[in-house]
Structures are given as C-alpha cells and as structure tokens.
Interface confidence: low
C-alpha cells in the first residue's frame, strides 16, 4: 500500500475509532432522552426522567415558578431501574409502566449486534496491521459500516420508544428532548458508516490505469 493510501487509511481508522468510542458511550449511558411533565405546582416537586438502552432513571426535582420541570441536572432524589429485557418472569416494578418493552428490547439487541460488528471489524484491523494483510481491511470496513447502520436502527427505535412514552396514558411525561447519549449515537453512526465506506474505498486494489490491464495485472501493493 502506498504512503498516501496508508495515510488515508490511518485517518479513516482514527475517525472510526472516534465512532467506536461514541458508540460505546451511547450504549452504556442512559441519557438518550429526557422526559418531563409540563405543569407543576409552586413549592412542590416534579418528576423528570432520563433513559437509555438498559435502564431508566427518574428524578424528583424541586420546583420553582417556571412551567417546565428541570433541567435534569438539578439536585433531586434519583431512582434508577434496569429494564428487565432477558428475565420476563420478573416484574420491573416501578418502571414497567414507563417504557414500551418491545422497543427497548429491540434497541438493546440491535446495539449488541452493532458492538459485535465493531469487535469483528477491530479484529480484522488488528490482524491487518500486525501481519500486513491489507485485504482484511475490506471486511473490517464492511463490519464498521454495518455497525453504523445498526446504531442508526437503534436510534430510530429509541425515537419511536420516546414517542410512545409521551403518547402513553400511563406516563406523566408530556415533553421531551434528546440528550447527549442520543447525540453520541448519531455521531457514531455518521463516523462508523462513512468511515467504513471510506475504508472500503481506500483498501480496494488500484484500478487498472490502462484499458488492456486487468485487476490481476496491476502492480502488487507493498
């Protein structure tokens, strides 16, 4: 592989690494969305919530005279509970009513697939760098692109989950905004998907310069 191509690959891999960090951050944190009730009584409290793929946290926030509940960063009594994705026999008690389980299960499962693709891609990259097996960058690029697509699907599933929660009769929340974990997931999708496509482009063999050359005739890449 030429020096310029190697430089492009390294820059792309750096972008993909940033995407991996952002994807990991999005998956493990629970600030995808912040939900809040609109109206409150002066001198009481309001209950805001933030949630991710694995758990939801509600926070009892002291109120002032404003119409809104929050921000969520205000001090208050916090109560977190994990979604019971994989043990349906158990009740998730207080938070059973606050999320549409089928959505969070789907989003979490797709996120796991995304992490799986990231691990496979990273293994290919490590093997490629270690033994100069440049051809391994191609499957790596595809794995990263697939990981990005999985993150995108998770993002969309979570968007639907938030919409369902807001529209639900069972929940107090009628206002919402997407938070930093959601932003991390969106950025991860862009970096992983575009980075994967760019890596695929840079790792492909040089196209023949002349009409009479075939791919097989092209100079071997060092």
């Amino acid at each position: 592989m030429s020096q310029t191509k190697m430089l492009k690959v390294r820059v792309t891999l750096f972008c993909i690494l940033a995407g991996i960090v952002l994807a990991m951050t999005a998956v493990v944190t629970d600030h995808w969305a912040v939900l809040s009730p609109h109206m409150e009584h002066h001198n009481t409290t309001c209950e805001a919530a933030h949630f991710g793929l694995w758990r939801i946290c509600t926070k009892r926030i002291p109120m002032d005279d404003s119409k809104t509940c929050g921000p969520i960063t205000l001090p208050g009594e916090k109560n977190c509970s994990y979604f019971r994705h994989f043990n349906p026999g158990e009740s998730s008690e207080i938070f059973e009513f606050t999320t549409q389980k089928e959505y969070s299960i789907s989003a979490a499962a797709i996120a796991i697939f995304s992490l799986g693709f990231i691990i496979l891609g990273s293994l290919c990259v490590l093997l490629s760098l270690g033994k100069k097996r440049d051809y391994l960058l191609r499957p790596a690029s595809m794995f990263y692109a697939f990981a990005g697509l999985c993150i995108l699907v998770s993002v969309e599933v979570m968007r639907q989950s938030v919409k369902r929660m807001i529209d639900s009769e069972d929940t107090v929340w009628i206002e919402y905004y997407y938070s930093w974990s959601f932003a991390c997931a969106c950025a991860a999708f862009i970096l992983l998907f575009l980075g994967g496509l760019a890596l695929l482009l840079f790792s492909l063999p040089r196209m023949p310069r002349n009409p009479w050359e075939s791919c097989m005739d092209a100079e071997p890449e060092h």
Epitope: P37, H38, M39, H41, E93, I94, F97, E169, V172
Partner: antibody, heavy 120, light 111 residues
Framework: QVQLVESGGGVVQPGRSLRLSCAAS????????MYWVRQTPGKGLEWVTV????????YYADSVKGRFTISRDNSKNTLFLQMNSLKTEDTAVYYC?????????????WGQGTMVTVSS | QSVLTQPPSVSGAPGQRVTISCTGS?????????VHWYQQLPGTAPRLLIS???NRPSGVPDRFSGSKSGTSASLAITGLQAEDEADYYC???????????FGGGTQLTVL
Amino acid sequence: QVQLVESGGGVVQPGRSLRLSCAASGFTFSTYGMYWVRQTPGKGLEWVTVISFDGNKKYYADSVKGRFTISRDNSKNTLFLQMNSLKTEDTAVYYCAKSSNWNYGSFDIWGQGTMVTVSS
Amino acid sequence: QSVLTQPPSVSGAPGQRVTISCTGSSSNIGAGYDVHWYQQLPGTAPRLLISYNSNRPSGVPDRFSGSKSGTSASLAITGLQAEDEADYYCQSYDRSLSGSVFGGGTQLTVL
C-alpha cells in the same frame, strides 16, 4: 387568591344533558392539568376525567366514557364538563380540581362543588 | 368497592396518635405511583393534606405525616385534636385504569 368556582348543577331527568363550568382564578390556568371529581351523597370520592394544560390529552373513568366530555377555554380560564345521557347513578356533587402534576399528581386546589341530581 | 382500601373508621382520644392505612395493588401504589391524602371536614370540599407520599403543603400542621411502603401507605396524626374529626381519603394513579383512584374514605372520630 387561588380559587375554583363551579356552576351549572341542578336537577335533570335521566337521559338528558347538563353542562358544568369551573371558573379559575389566582393562578396561571393554562399551565395546569385540570380534573373533575365527584362524590355521591354519603359516599366516597370518584375521579371522573382529566384534561391536560393545552387540552390535547383527555382521559375518562370507564363509568362516564362516551357520555361525558371535558374541555377548557384557556383564554377565559374556564373548565367545562358536558354530561350527556345522564343516569341516576351520576347523581353527585361535582368538584373541579387543579392538578399538581398532570395525570399523576395530587389535587392541590378544589372548588366548592356543584350538586347534580338525576331524577325522574 | 374502591380500588384503594381504607378502614371505614378510626377513633382516638385528644392528644393520642392515630394512623390510617391505605392498601393498593401492583397496578397503583405498588407500581411506584405516589400517594396523596385529603381531609374533608363535614359539609366542605376536600383539601390536600399530604402530597407525594410525605410532603405537607403550607398551612398543614406538622402533626400530620405520611409514608409509603410497597403496595400500601399510611397517614399518621399525632396530638389528636377535636378539629381533626373529618373524613380522610387516599389517592393514587392506577395504570390499568389509566386514571386516578381513591380510597373509600376513613371517618376519624375524636372521642
């Protein structure tokens, strides 16, 4: 001062209609969910219906679903309850109440109540 | 039959401590929804006594206190006074009914 004043109660025959009003003052009416709660003579309290601050969300008790309609006019600080196809079991004192937290919190302000008697 | 269960009546002598229980189920109090308490003096509208399980609105004496545990809640009144004679109601939200629910009410008699 913060207060709610109901009106529109009276004696009505079964199957007829009645419209209750609740005038709010002393607080920003347009930012709070509002309820109707009733109390049958000598009995306990029963939640009837709730409406969100903007009027977009409305929920009803099963006993009145399809017959009662809650609405509000934020420009006039007034809450309404349209009661159709009234039954004798709808006889009660009807209170309007202010919600402290949408469909989930306490009723922190109550009106004095208006009596509705459904009798033939 | 009320969704939340309260004793029909309790009584106590002046200065005594009385408690009123409110028992729900996994679809209301047990699901994590808050419990609120109301006092209704004879011939008047109910008034909020305890909100969000244990919060006293301004103007409510500190003789009144509330607590919640599991699927039940309780209202405690210490230093009972003659003017406390009233009906007391608990209220919560029930997810299966998609609305608020009340207890049947407890009549407190000061002996």
